[in-house]
Interface confidence: low
Amino acid sequence: MIPTFTALLCLGLSLGPRTHMQAGPLPKPTLWAEPGSVISWGNSVTIWCQGTLEAREYRLDKEESPAPWDRQNPLEPKNKARFSIPSMTEDYAGRYRCYYRSPVGWSQPSDPLELVMTGAYSKPTLSALPSPLVTSGKSVTLLCQSRSPMDTFLLIKERAAHPLLHLRSEHGAQQHQAEFPMSPVTSVHGGTYRCFSSHGFSHYLLSHPSDPLELIVSGSLEDPRPSPTRSVSTAAGPEDQPLMPTGSVPHSGLRRHWEVLIGVLVVSILLLSLLLFLLLQHWRQGKHRTLAQRQADFQRPPGAAEPEPKDGGLQRRSSPAADVQGENFCAAVKNTQPEDGVEMDTRQSPHDEDPQAVTYAKVKHSRPRREMASPPSPLSGEFLDTKDRQAEEDRQMDTEAAASEAPQDVTYAQLHSFTLRQKATEPPPSQEGASPAEPSVYATLAIH
């Protein structure tokens, strides 16, 4: 189920405070959701607001709802409050901010939290063109298709090591799809993908996830065979017709934030280095230990625990709030080119323990439609035109948003026109220590 899709959308830093409140000198609180900000329909979610120990009251505001949306007394030791949603529905999806009141007045608003509900629409179809079996160095296009008009598509890769980027194909007239080209394909592209679809007018409502598609890259060191528990999805149904624009989306409207794994990756590398260092120290100490010490170790009764390291070991923090107190790794890019009218905003949420990588594509009809230069993709007419006359009968409205139970990475990109043409089809070979290949598109790490 989608609760495993626990990545929080990065809290937007550019939106001003609500005008109806007097913003005081108090520091802003931190807002997050557990188990995550992307929740499937019917599941429970808890929104947490963490302020200071002086807080007397917390309030949660939801955009476009009468304020305050909810008020709560703080939980001991008074530095946070809990707002519970027992069953996720469309009404709860949206952008939230919280405030706290102390003896000196109300705090500044928190950064916004975007609560997204999945399962709002029927699942799209994800396919790979020309095939999900691709040779390293070649090109492949992942195609996310919705049977009905949609204008936003998200691509998720499980356990991705880097963000994916995406060039949007032009908007057709009556149905819709999004193409996610990958070129040249390397072994890092291999893995399991899913996509979601959504409407621009309700950014916070996503479809059920598509069935998983396993992209298998051959000619690499990895075993090219798919895992027996995963099926290779190759069928693109008849739902590949283009779409008419779904009304106009306000240019200054609800902005999406896309999450990059850089911060998590850096932390992971640091932790890995620390682990190696500790192991090395342990190994070195082991060489110099006396025979008596070794015998004492050998005679330790069964079940006796190893002594805990002085630093507490590499324990995973259980509270997202604890993460917030540390560095907030937030990668931000604003690549706004007057010609292309493209704005990309990349941020890393501080709360994620099990992030996912998502590529998000949204088209805004901000100016007259123009054909977009898109990279040649080896689309097979027969492949796309596979006739499934039983489509309606066979089609299943998934009542479960069956997402993978594995951690996943998330990337969002917002496209404001059809004219985006950047070298964005080539993701960095790896972000493990390597500097981003495309500085105009890939975010450099910013520590706030």
Epitope: S122, Q174, Q175, P238, D240, R369
Partner: antibody
């Protein structure tokens, strides 16, 4: 079986608003697809007017955008066409249709005359 | 708007004959995904239009195989291999790529 049926006033005076209803049976309009209004003028010319998608998104013919609105009542499985400031030029047979591969299901149509 | 021009306006045929209707779009209706969003509809007297062909050559469910569509780019053809009485009516081509989607003016298939 999916069926669509249009209903409306039949006669509207110029400058008034026209309201038509399409009642869908055999399929929920919130499940999938786009639900369209198409009209056919005397002389057989067909014109696409707009749609409301299963999730509530709308799209309209630019030539009508200033005076058209398509809404729905999901509890009744109906969607509606409102056309403001009608003139005699809006005299036509109005069809509702479902968009899937193409317009695969159509209503029988309702004839609307704009006359004073 | 994309103009869809059909020829002929009227097509008198004998039952059992082959019929051919042409349709030309004022601009390409080929999507970048390789698909061409050209459809054909038949409207019989007193009825609403019915979908025959989608994406140039794909017969819709229940449409007899005597109907076939062909063409590319801007020029398209609908062929009926052996005309039957139930095929009589007005045929419309339609483009679904550009906004707004547009219909051709229609070709009336009638008995000679």
């Amino acid at each position: 079986d999916v069926q669509l049926q249009e209903s409306g006033p039949g006669l509207v005076k110029p400058s008034q608003s026209l309201s038509l209803t399409c009642t869908v049976t055999g399929y929920s309009i919130t499940s999938d697809y786009a639900w369209n209004w198409i009209r056919q003028f005397p002389g057989n010319k067909l014109e696409w007017m707009g749609y409301i998608s299963y999730s509530g998104g709308t799209s309209y013919n630019p030539s009508l955008k200033s005076r058209i609105s398509i809404t729905r009542d999901t509890s009744k499985n109906q969607f509606f066409l409102q056309l403001n400031s009608v003139t005699t030029e809006d005299t036509a047979t109005y069809y509702c249709a479902r968009l899937h591969y193409g317009y695969d299901y159509w209503g029988l149509g309702t004839t609307l005359t704009v006359s004073s | 708007d994309v103009l869809m021009t059909q020829t002929p306006l009227s097509l008198p045929v004998s039952l059992g004959d082959q019929a051919s209707i042409s349709c030309r779009s004022s601009q390409s209706i080929v999507h970048s995904n390789g698909n061409t969003y050209l459809e054909w509809y038949l409207q019989k007297p007193g009825q609403s239009p019915k979908l025959l062909i989608y994406k140039v050559s794909n017969r819709f469910s229940g449409v007899p195989d005597r109907f076939s569509g062909s063409g590319s780019g801007t020029d398209f053809t609908l062929k009926i291999s052996r005309v039957e009485a139930e095929d009589l009516g007005v045929y419309y081509c339609f483009q679904g790529l550009h906004v707004p989607p547009t219909f051709g003016g229609g070709t009336k298939l009638e008995i000679k």
